[in-house]
């Protein structure tokens, strides 16, 4: 018996058509992805093949304006349209809270989402109660299969989940539920969910019983053969991993951004034994058209978008100063405000012993792109965010050692003077350069603001000490030259969209007026 | 809505045995279990074992397994329960009941079917 | 096989009362539980599945808590119409089982 599973994980807002590099689609000969070209694949494939499956595996939420304006309920409409079987919920289904997932999706979805490791307590279990599942059974042409979901244990760290759920250890978490499923005679179960390509591969190994693992949260790339675009391939597509109990388990991702949909094909044995897996992501490029009805339904939701763009979202009563004449030279008003939006956006107090998990931010000074003049009645919309931060990235949470944060804020100044964009703006630390040094040995003070303390205050950065730090998703890739944070980070874990973060922060401020205060210093 | 309506009462002989249908209506009946509850006079509830219409797929209640066969004819949206070497324990009302695969909670039950076994 | 104790076998309580019935699992159900209401000469009625989760037109004055192997049912204000039968379920393990039930009579 065979299965065709089609897969989708960190969409992460993409519901129209985007550039290779997921951004804002410009030359549409050239776009790829959204939900109206993968909507022309998915039904090519259900026409041709008997079993097919969809499956999402979560971070649907977050990334575009699309979000912010319709918090979710984009992601129900759209996956509704789609016909997909089920979705896993990811650490971003939280960004909005509890009350974010439950009404706009989880009351919305016609298919079921999953996680058998999130456990809802207190007053919230009977408000959540059946809205998501630890599994589904779903009848496949003349056969049933089961999809597990799970959800990464760091999500109250990532996300907001508030206090009312216990995100469990994954493996602990699905064992006893497929044995459930095993119960029932569900002898094909698919493993769905948002942990990272590390864990997906620790499940397919240890939790017995499971037949195929479907992931996401890492942005992992799996392909067999020449890849189609610009996307290094982590491994090949499916990734096999041998189980502890014998079997062969293919496990798979499909990158993010809807830019891929994953095609795997399984063939079973009449016992539900994998015989074989072989598949490869199909690029949604231009070539597949975009079909016509979901498209005319995008461009129906598209005009609210355009309407909030010019909303007033706060007011600033200094100028920001995001000019490359300031931000790539010295420390800028602009920067401050971003990466203090950047530790407002991830404020966690999940530990009586630290006020925050995190208090440092560090951003490229290149990726400030405009300033705002306050002379506009002060008034912030969209539309002059997205001047400032036109890129659409993210900004992440990272885990790295001291002595990486030395070199990276000895490669902010290697050159300095060029207006090159690797120049750092900071929040959370106390930076002074000497730049009569030579390059490489031009950082003479870096303190960092404590986290474990109950008044925060600044300390000399410690090199073997691991610290978290925000900063954008274009940094902790390597870009600007900052290849020892790629090669040297610890973890690495998706954020907000940029814009989405600082539009926050200022709709939360109402009025702002960030200062140079003196973090970056030159002796 | 969803209605489940099962034959009538049925009296039979020790050794005998008996088939009980359940017709269904109100909803894809191929894509919910349908299972069969019987209830002994004056005691409680017995599980006995489920169908799955989709495929046929069946599940007993091992204290069953040999003597209880259920069938389905997807034509009609009928399920059938016959139980073999009747003795007069399996004196009882016999419920089918809709549960979906994966939780089996009933949230619909048919009218019920006496089933007498005397000599 | 999972058994299901119900505690108590019957209870006498007026209108108003505010009435509590608890089931025991003889081993951990990781909250598969159902309750049903049966009034003589019917079929079962199903209140609560998933512990707590009220069934489409059961009225809120019903539900249900517990977690593990412990589980109650209690009814805020006992009404007329709520003098009945009442049986858990679970449906963690085959073969699914039910309590041996608790009659709620009139005091």
């Known amino acids: 018996w065979e299965l065709t599973i089609l897969h989708t994980n960190d969409v992460h807002s993409r519901l129209e058509q985007t550039s290779e590099d997921s951004s804002k689609c410009v030359n549409a000969s050239r776009c790829m992805g959204g939900v109206a070209r993968l909507f022309t694949k998915v039904q090519q494939i259900r026409r041709a093949e008997p079993n097919v499956l969809l499956l999402d595996a979560g971070d649907q939420y977050q990334g575009t304006i699309w979000f912010t304006v319709y918090k979710g309920a984009e992601v129900a409409h759209f996956m509704n349209a789609l016909r997909y079987d089920a979705m896993a919920l990811g650490n971003h289904e939280f960004d909005n809270g509890v009350e974010g997932l439950i009404e706009p999706l989880l009351k919305e979805a016609k298919f079921p989402i999953l996680s058998a490791n999130i456990k809802a307590k207190g007053p919230l279990a009977s408000q959540i109660s059946g809205l998501y599942l630890p599994y589904k059974v779903l009848p496949v042409g003349d056969e049933v299969v089961g999809i597990v979901g799970y959800t990464s244990k760091e999500t109250p760290f990532l996300s907001n989940p508030g206090t009312n759920l216990v995100f469990e250890d994954e493996i602990t978490a699905l064992q006893p539920e497929v044995d459930k499923l095993k119960t029932l005679n569900v002898n094909k179960i698919i493993a769905l969910g948002h942990s990272g390509f590390e864990m997906d591969k620790l499940i397919a190994q240890k939790v017995r019983g499971v037949d195929v693992v479907v992931g996401g949260h890492s942005n992992t790339f799996l392909y067999t053969g020449n890849p189609p675009s610009k996307e290094v391939p982590a491994g090949k597509y499916p990734f096999i991993v041998t189980s502890d109990d014998g079997r062969k388990v293919p496990v798979v991702q499909a990158y993010a951004f809807g830019k891929y949909l994953g095609y795997l094909k399984i063939e079973f044995d009449e016992r539900g034994n994998v015989i074989s897996s072989h598949g490869n992501p199909i690029l949604l490029n231009s070539s597949i058209p975009e079909d016509p009805s979901i498209k005319a339904d995008i461009n129906k939701w598209r005009i609210k978008l355009d309407n909030y763009s010019t909303q007033e979202l706060g007011k600033t009563i200094v100028y920001l100063d995001g000019s490359s004449q300031s931000c790539r030279f010295r420390e800028c008003n602009m920067g401050n405000l971003i990466c203090d939006a950047m530790i407002n956006n991830n404020l966690r107090h999940t530990d009586e012993m630290f006020w925050n998990h995190v208090s440092m931010c560090i951003l490229n000074g290149g990726g400030i792109r405009s300033p705002i003049d306050e002379r506009n009645n002060g008034t912030i919309t969209w539309e002059n965010l997205a001047a400032v931060l036109p890129f659409g990235g993210t900004f992440d949470l990272v885990q790295l050692k001291g002595s990486t944060l030395k070199k990276a804020f000895e490669h902010s100044v290697h050159r300095y003077g060029q207006s090159t964009g690797e120049f750092l703006q900071v929040g959370g630390i106390h930076v002074v350069y000497d730049l009569s040094r030579k390059p490489g040995d031009r950082v003479v003070k870096l303190d960092v603001l404590c986290t474990k303390c109950r008044v925060p205050s600044y300390d000399p950065l410690k090199m073997d000490e691991v610290y978290k730090v925000i900063l954008p998703n274009f940094l902790a890739n390597g870009g600007d030259g900052f290849q020892m944070i790629k090669d040297e980070l610890l973890r690495h874990d998706s954020g907000d969209q940029d814009i989405n973060v600082v539009s926050t922060y200022i709709s939360k401020m109402k009025v702002i007026y960030p200062a140079v205060e003196g973090r970056i210093k030159f002796s | 809505q969803v209605q489940l309506v099962q034959s009538g009462a049925e009296v039979k002989k020790p050794g005998a045995s008996v088939k009980v249908s359940c017709k269904a209506s109100?909803?894809?009946?191929?894509?919910?279990?349908i299972h069969w509850v019987r209830q002994a006079p004056g005691q409680g509830l017995e599980w006995m074992g489920a169908?799955?219409?989709?495929?046929?797929?069946?599940s007993y209640n091992q204290k069953f397994k040999g003597r209880v066969t259920m069938t389905r004819d997807t034509s009609t949206s009928t399920v059938y329960m016959e139980l073999s070497s009747l003795r007069s324990e399996d004196t009882a009302v016999y419920y089918c009941?809709?549960?979906?695969?994966?939780?089996?909670?009933?949230?619909?039950w048919g009218q019920g079917t006496l089933v007498t076994v005397s000599s | 096989d999972i058994q299901m104790t119900q505690s108590p076998s019957s209870l006498s309580a007026s209108v108003g009362d505010r009435v509590t019935i608890t089931c025991k699992a003889s081993?951990?159900?990781?909250?598969?539980l159902a309750w049903y209401q049966q009034k003589p000469g019917k079929a079962p009625k199903l209140l609560l599945y998933?512990?707590?989760s009220l069934e489409t037109g059961v009225p809120s004055r019903f539900s249900g808590s517990g977690s593990g192997t412990d589980y109650t049912l209690t009814i805020s204000s006992l009404q007329p119409e709520d003098f009945a039968t009442y049986y858990c379920?679970?449906?963690?393990?085959?073969?699914?089982?039910f309590g041996g039930g608790t009659k709620v009579e009139i005091k």
């Open positions: 009941a809709r549960g979906d695969y994966d939780e089996s909670y009933f949230d619909y």
């Open positions: 109100g909803y894809t009946f191929t894509t919910y279990n």
């Open positions: 169908i799955f219409p989709g495929n046929g797929h069946i």
């Open positions: 081993e951990g159900i990781y909250n598969r």
């Open positions: 998933g512990v707590i």
């Open positions: 379920q679970q449906y963690w393990s085959i073969p699914w089982t």
